[in-house]
């Protein structure tokens, strides 16, 4: 006869591990007892259990409540046991010693591998600001046994660096993603992908990039100066900029206070029917937590009568 077992039994943390030990004997052979022991402890062999043809299953105190026989139907030649709720400390070498009649004793050894799936965490780096050099965008850490694989999935251009820390029964892997911040990266996903044999599928943690910036400010509304004449209604100036965080707008007049009747509505400055009083230098002040920008324009409200008089003068001068 001979013993049938596995070289390696692999289970995920918390699962039950079946430790196989089956005696493939000739007809008429009987198994008297099967002794299971853990054999990689420093002091000596640590008995798990004894399966006795007469006394049944006897579990040693250290494994009480954790070792069982597989559910029926049971073959009397099967010395396999179940180790319930495998923990990381169970990883190691085990042997079964089988006493048979009349063939004598047999022994087999196996390695129990307990996979500890990682619980990854993603930590964003410092605030990203346009104009910085190479900056940490995020780091992703996963600890497990064996060491997990940590990679990045993103459209953003950057560089990665990984380091690993070995512990007694596991390894922690940290991967960092560095980039040169630019406004085009804003709102882009940066996904940490963790692979491990104990996971049914890769674990993914997504971080949305936020890059602080503030675009140059400009003012729209003065494209056609001829429209800015006395009496015109609905005249307005619009301040153009963009930023992250979204900027706030403030309007001032450089050569005095804003004229009465002028309405400030965020990025827009709305005028009542134009008068010459509205002529002046207007400043749009754009700011966010990252920066501030100014843009100024000169409004010159035209008097059509003056213009026509001038034209007459010009004509008469000719």
């Amino acid at each position: 006869g001979e013993l049938e077992t596995s070289d390696v039994v692999t289970v995920v943390l918390g699962q039950d591990a079946k430790l196989p030990c089956f005696y493939r004997g000739d007809s008429g052979e009987q198994v008297g007892q099967v002794a299971w022991a853990r054999v990689d402890a420093g002091e000596g062999a640590q008995e798990l259990a004894l399966l006795h043809s007469k006394y049944g299953l006897h579990v040693s105190p250290a494994y009480e409540g954790r070792v069982e026989q597989p559910p029926p139907p049971r073959n009397p030649l099967d010395g396999s046991v179940l180790l319930r709720n495998a923990v990381q400390a169970d990883e190691g070498e085990y042997e079964c010693r089988v006493s048979t009649f009349p063939a004598g004793s047999f022994q087999a050894r196996l390695r129990l591998r307990v996979l500890v799936p990682p619980l990854p965490s993603l930590n964003p780096g410092p605030a990203l600001e346009e104009g910085q050099g190479l900056t940490l965008a995020a780091s992703c850490t996963a600890e497990g046994s064996p060491a997990p694989s940590v990679t990045w999935d993103t459209e953003v251009k950057g560089t990665t660096s990984s380091r690993s820390f070995k512990h007694s029964r596991s390894a922690a892997v940290t991967s960092e993603f560095h980039l040169v911040p630019s406004r085009s990266m804003n709102g882009q996903p940066l996904t940490c992908v963790v692979s491990h044999p104990g996971l049914l599928q890769d674990q993914r943690i997504t971080h949305i990039l936020h890059v602080s910036f503030l675009a140059e400010a400009s003012v729209r509304g003065l494209e056609d100066q001829n429209l800015w004449h006395i009496g015109r209604e609905g005249a307005m100036l619009k301040c153009l900029s963009e930023g992250q965080p979204p900027p706030s707008y403030n309007w001032t007049r450089l050569d005095g206070p804003l004229p009465s009747g002028v309405r400030v509505d965020g990025d827009t400055l709305g005028f009542p029917p134009l008068t010459t009083e509205h002529s002046g230098i207007y400043v749009c002040h754009v700011s966010n937590e990252f920066s501030s920008r100014d843009s100024q324009v000169t409004v010159d409200v035209l008097d059509p009568q003056e213009d026509s008089g001038k034209q007459v003068d010009l004509v008469s001068a000719s």
Epitope: G44, A45, Q46, E47, H52, S60, A62, E95, R97, S99
Partner: antibody, heavy 120, light 111 residues
Framework: EVQLQQSGPELVKPGASVKISCKTS????????IHWVKQNHGKSLEWIGR????????IHNQNFMGKATLTVDKSSSTAYMELRSLTSEDSAVCYC?????????????WGQGTLVTVSA | DIVMTQSPTSLVVSLGQRATISCRAS??????????MHWYQQKPGQPPKLLIK???NLESGVPARFSGSGSGTDFTLNIHPVEEEDTATYYC?????????FGGGTKLEIK
């Protein structure tokens, strides 16, 4: 310090029973199997059986089935062995024993022994 | 049951010399990791004392002049150099299966 303290010598008549004790200290009683070993005068050692104090499971040497009954009292961390239907062949020193730390095999700790004398 | 046969049954060794005691099991008691064989010393009126576990591992507190060797079925206990206090009976024991059995003992005398 691990200690196994056995009860004193017993002089019993043939056919009677005797119950000897093994009081343990210095460790958690339920974490180690207690073994019993017999030694006839001037002779070798014979393993009687073992008991798991955690659940009371017993495995006997077939030679002692019906002769030795093993029990424990967890509250006092004490193991007991009762020998019944005694004959002169049962006169012996009986030991309780325990394995060492980190190993289930080899008896690192022993009681001092209890001499059982069966005589009319 | 596994039968343990010890030899010699008695042994006289001069102080400072080597004492060699043999033990043979009726079947192998060795796996790739361990030999399930242990040696004990017993002095009159005392319980046995574990000297060597797993064929060759010296028990804590036991003098280094005691050593064990062997695998499979044949095992040896060596004491060198012997001292007066080593006068005792020595037993081998297997823990391969139930029942655990002991050898018949070897009585060592120092002259």
């Amino acid at each position: 310090e691990v200690q196994l303290q056995q009860s004193g010598p017993e002089l019993v008549k043939p056919g009677a029973s005797v119950k000897i004790s093994c009081k343990t200290s210095g460790y958690t009683f339920t974490e180690y199997t207690i073994h019993w070993v017999k030694q006839n005068h001037g002779k070798s050692l014979e393993w009687i059986g073992r008991i798991n104090p955690k659940n009371g499971d017993i495995i006997h040497n077939q030679n002692f089935m019906g002769k030795a009954t093993l029990t424990v009292d967890k509250s006092s961390s004490t193991a007991y062995m009762e020998l019944r239907s005694l004959t002169s062949e049962d006169s012996a020193v009986c030991y309780c024993a325990r394995s060492g730390y980190g190993s289930s095999y080899g008896f690192a700790y022993w009681g001092q022994g209890t001499l059982v004398t069966v005589s009319a | 049951d596994i039968v343990m046969t010890q030899s010699p049954t008695s042994l006289v060794v001069s102080l400072g010399q080597r004492a060699t005691i043999s033990c043979r099991a009726s079947q192998s008691v060795t796996t790739p990791r361990y030999s399930y064989m242990h040696w004990y010393q017993q002095k009159p009126g005392q319980p046995p004392k574990l000297l060597i576990k797993y064929a060759s591992n010296l028990e804590s507190g036991v003098p280094a002049r005691f050593s064990g060797s062997g695998s499979g079925t044949d095992f040896t206990l060596n004491i060198h150099p012997v001292e007066e206090e080593d006068t005792a009976t020595y037993y081998c024991q297997h823990s391969w299966e139930i029942p655990y059995t002991f050898g018949g003992g070897t009585k060592l005398e120092i002259k």
